[in-house]
């Protein structure tokens, strides 16, 4: 019996009967057998075929198998209904061999010319199987030249059979505190050879519960406990199961905060498999009351481990844990049951006793010594002397625990002095000047340090001077001796003040004119108004309207008198203001320079002479009565002017306050 | 965590103010609780000065409430000791600590001041 | 102002002894809200006080459990049962109850 080829060599060729393409013999038996490497499979046709038509081919034909499998038993020339010629069909192997058998028998009523068939291997596709089969793969089949290989989706890895797809189904850890979990896939079918472990792992003082759910699927056995497919439950205390079968299993309470569910699947079978619902449970905490006038956030049936709840005081309370503050407040719940923070009170907001105004006093107006939430108190600042600034006064106890005005402002309203109260009325012009009576001028300053000088009140901590009278100690401010609150200069009972810092004009220069000699002096503290210490206003913007030729400004100081002598008491004059031209041109014939009067400055006397301001009046104010706001406010300051005091044809010269008002305020603002 | 430093001048002369400073680090000082100033005296003895609120909110020791004073800077997250008019019996190691529940659970490690012409 | 008592100023131990020191306040320290503010702080040389026990009874956390505090109204115990080297120094009861909050003069535990 012939061979046909082998693998390796190549596969493929041609078979016909013997004699062919004449007639074949009578007796004739033939066999080939072929063989295509692994993974391959022969193809066969006919391109010829005439033998012996007989029932059910029992005389003359040709026979295909593979294996044991017989594929066709072939004769006559066309297909009957018993009976099969190939005609343009083709054949194939069902694996890598192919045999081919012909045969005749001992007679042929006419001749037949027999067969020619071609054959080839060619690749199997592994990947395509008939209906009804069982997949070649689990997932995904790949075909290729001589076999294939199976790969898995995401989640599986390939069984070492290399066409199971088993599940990556371990190394999940639930840590919350309820979930669900369920077999691979579920509720579609399990995958096969897979080995799954879960585990639940809670807090200590946790204890999971296990609910099966919706279905349960697990193959089984009538005889043996689950043989096939299982899944078990363990803690730390006990094992479940196995179980498998069609029931849902009861309700577990492990009464441990760590459980291990293993499921384990064979090769077999097609069951939808398990879901689990778990819940966890701990011993509970004391519920929560809420302090009076506050409420507890979340509110719940009960509080276990890791619950927690905030205390959330109304409008007005705020917490307080005993003494002390809090801005906030959480507990949690403890796995021993008790919660890890005592609970606060909800206590109402007390602002605490007013702060002291200084120059003022305070009232409670909601009841005596009353400070909490909504309690009204009415600062106020003592009459006559003190007004209160920007402000009514009236603060309320807010929720923030901060006594807070009408405007929203925390901080204590300002009793700021009132400045331009004097006891004098405008009297008659007396020559030479006259005695100061007691709060005639309160804001007059007497400076001592060096030289005798003098200098007026701006609110309660300032001093408005000129700069050639403190030039000298601008470096050395604690050196001046300040003195108010008296009219006699050698007097024992005065108000004494100390200088904390002293300004001078960055425009002034000494010894050189006296354009913009002007200065201020911070003192170290506050001073007390009263009567005899007042001080003077800074001149309004239409403080102008007031200052005109001729307006009467009054000057005071201790400042040489005509009999040449320091004043022993207070002295003052009434002089008009002298056009500033005419100043201007008495100043500049010799000895005086020219353009010793500056537009900083202004001039007031009399033509006459005989009323002035003299050596030691410097610094001193000259003020005038504004007659709308019926104060007194300083126009000018005391420069300089003739050698001789009271000249006629010279005037007094003085510093134009009102050219510096921005310089005052910002050294004040800043300072 | 929360952790607080006192600084300050290690020498101070009588009739002077004293102003200390503690710096605060890991925990805003306006977030909550009370920011304490507390004083250890050469003896041992402990002494609570007063505290300043989340809020700004302050509570004195009423023996020291005239010359004491607490204040803050949220920006720096830092609060202050001002203690006027100092005698020699002010000298003291002073500590700053932050309250929770309970009073002192945080406490700087200190700083020593001396009073002495 | 309350005043914090304690006794004994000195307390002389071997390692291993149980210790107790004495708290007694001049007036209730019941706080209007039920909570007793009692507190323990340790300071050892060269350190700043630590917290040990916080309303009467409960650690602070990391302070090990050889600490117990006990008491009510005026009367308050802390106890060490067995002393190890760690816990010498100086031991201060404090009052949080009332404003001004205040410290007792301290007890010394100390090696025989």
């Known amino acids: 019996t012939p061979l046909g080829p082998k693998w390796p060599e190549p596969v493929f060729g041609r078979l016909a009967s013997p004699g062919f393409p004449g007639e074949y013999a009578n007796d004739q038996e033939r066999r080939w057998t072929l063989t295509a490497p692994p993974g391959y499979r022969l193809r066969l046709y006919f391109t010829h075929f005439d033998l012996e038509l007989s029932h059910l081919c029992e005389y003359d034909f040709v026979k295909l198998s593979s294996g044991a499998k017989v594929l066709a038993t072939l004769c006559g020339q066309e297909s009957t209904d018993t009976e099969r010629a190939p005609g343009k069909d083709t054949f194939y192997s069902l694996g890598s061999s192919l045999d081919i058998t012909f045969r005749s028998d001992y007679s042929n009523e006419k001749p037949f010319t027999g067969f020619e068939a071609f054959y080839a291997a060619e690749d199997i596709d592994e990947c395509q199987v008939a209906p009804g089969e069982a997949p070649t793969c689990d997932h995904h089949c790949h075909n290729h030249l001589g076999g294939f290989y199976c790969s898995c989706r995401a989640g599986y890895v390939l069984h070492r059979n290399k066409r199971t797809c088993s599940a990556l189904c371990s190394g999940q850890v639930f840590t919350q505190r309820s979930g669900e979990l369920s077999s691979p896939e579920y509720p579609r079918p399990y995958p096969k050879l897979s080995s799954c472990t879960y585990s639940i792992s809670l807090e200590e003082g946790f204890s999971v519960i296990l609910d099966f759910v919706e279905s349960f699927d697990v193959e089984t056995h009538p005889e043996t406990l689950c043989p096939y497919d299982f899944l078990k439950i363990q803690t730390d205390r006990e094992e479940h199961g196995p179980f498998c079968g069609k029931t849902l299993p009861h309700r577990i309470e492990t009464k441990s905060n760590t459980v291990t569910i293993t499921f384990v699947t064979d090769e077999s079978g097609d069951h939808t498999g398990w879901k689990i619902h778990y819940t966890s449970t701990a011993q509970p905490c004391p519920y929560p009351m809420a302090p009076p006038n506050g409420h507890v956030s979340p509110v719940q049936a009960k509080y276990i481990l890791k619950d927690s709840f905030s205390i959330f005081c109304e409008t007005g309370y705020e917490l307080l844990q005993g003494h002390l503050p809090l801005k906030s407040f959480t507990a949690v719940c403890q796995k021993d049951g008790s919660w890890d923070r005592p609970m606060p009170a909800c206590s109402i907001v007390d602002c605490g006793p007013p702060d002291d105004l200084p120059s003022g006093r305070v009232e409670y107006i909601t009841g005596p010594g009353v400070t909490t939430y909504k309690a009204v108190i009415q600062y106020s600042c003592e009459e006559t002397f003190y007004t209160m600034k920007v402000n009514d006064g009236k603060y309320v106890c807010e929720a923030d625990g901060f006594w807070t005005s009408s405007k929203g402002e925390k901080s204590l309203p300002v009793c700021e002095p009132v400045c331009g109260l004097s006891a004098r009325t405008t009297g008659g012009r007396i020559y030479g000047g006259q005695k100061a009576k007691p709060g005639d001028f309160p804001w007059q300053v007497l400076i001592l340090g060096g030289t005798t000088a003098a200098g007026a009140l701006l609110y309660d901590n300032w001093v408005l001077t000129a700069a050639h009278a403190v030039y000298e100690q601008k470096h050395d401010a604690s050196a001046l001796d300040i003195r108010m609150g008296t009219l006699k200069r050698l007097s024992p009972h005065y108000t004494q003040a100390w200088s904390e810092a002293v300004f001078i004009h960055e425009g002034y220069t000494h010894d050189a004119g006296f354009d913009n000699d002007i200065a201020l002096i911070k003192l170290n503290n506050k001073v007390v108004i009263n009567s005899n210490i007042t001080p003077i206003c800074l001149p309004r913007k239409e403080a102008e309207s007031f200052m005109r030729t001729d307006d009467i400004g009054t000057a005071s100081g201790w400042g040489l008198t005509q009999r040449g002598f320091l004043a022993r008491n207070l002295m003052y004059v009434d002089i008009p203001i002298v056009d500033h031209q005419k100043c201007t041109a008495a100043y500049e014939k010799p000895p005086y320079p020219r353009g010793s009067v500056t537009a900083n400055m202004l001039c007031a006397g009399l033509e006459s002479g005989g009323k002035d301001s003299c050596r030691g009046d410097s610094g001193g104010a000259l003020v005038f009565l504004d007659s709308e706001t019926e104060r007194w406010f300083v126009g000018g300051i005391v420069s300089w002017g003739s050698m001789n005091c009271g000249e006629a044809g010279q005037y007094g010269v003085y510093t134009k306050v009102i050219n510096y008002i921005p310089w005052i305020e910002n050294i004040i603002s800043d300072f | 965590d929360v952790q607080l430093q006192e600084s300050g001048p290690g020498l101070v002369k009588p009739s002077q103010s004293l102003s200390l400073t503690c710096t605060v680090t890991g925990f805003s000082i306006t977030s909550d609780y009370a920011w304490n100033w507390i004083r250890q005296f050469p003896g041992n003895k402990l002494e609570w000065m007063g505290y300043i609120s989340y809020s700004g909110r302050t509570n004195y020791n009423p023996s020291l409430k005239s010359r004491f004073s607490i204040t803050r800077d949220t920006s720096k997250n830092q609060f202050f000791l001002q203690l006027n008019s100092v005698t020699t019996e002010d000298t003291a190691t002073y500590y700053c600590?932050?309250?929770?529940?309970?009073?002192?659970?945080?406490w700087g490690q200190g700083t020593l001041v001396t009073v002495s012409a | 102002d309350v005043l914090m008592t304690q006794t004994p100023l000195s307390l002389p131990v071997s390692l291993g002894d149980q210790a107790s020191i004495s708290c007694r306040s001049s007036q209730s320290i019941v706080h209007s809200n039920g909570n007793t503010f009692l507190e323990w702080y340790l300071q050892k040389p060269g350190q700043s006080p630590k917290l040990l026990i916080y309303?009467?009874?409960n650690r602070f956390s990391g302070v090990p459990d050889r600490f117990s505090g006990s008491g009510s109204g005026t009367d308050f115990t802390l106890k060490i049962s067995r002393v190890e080297a760690e816990d010498l120094g100086v031991y201060y009861c404090?009052?949080?109850?009332?404003?001004?909050?205040?410290f007792g003069a301290g007890t010394k535990l100390e090696l025989k």
């Open positions: 404090f009052q949080g109850s009332h404003i001004p909050v205040t």
């Open positions: 309303k009467v009874s």
């Open positions: 600590a932050r309250s929770y529940d309970y009073w002192f659970p945080y």
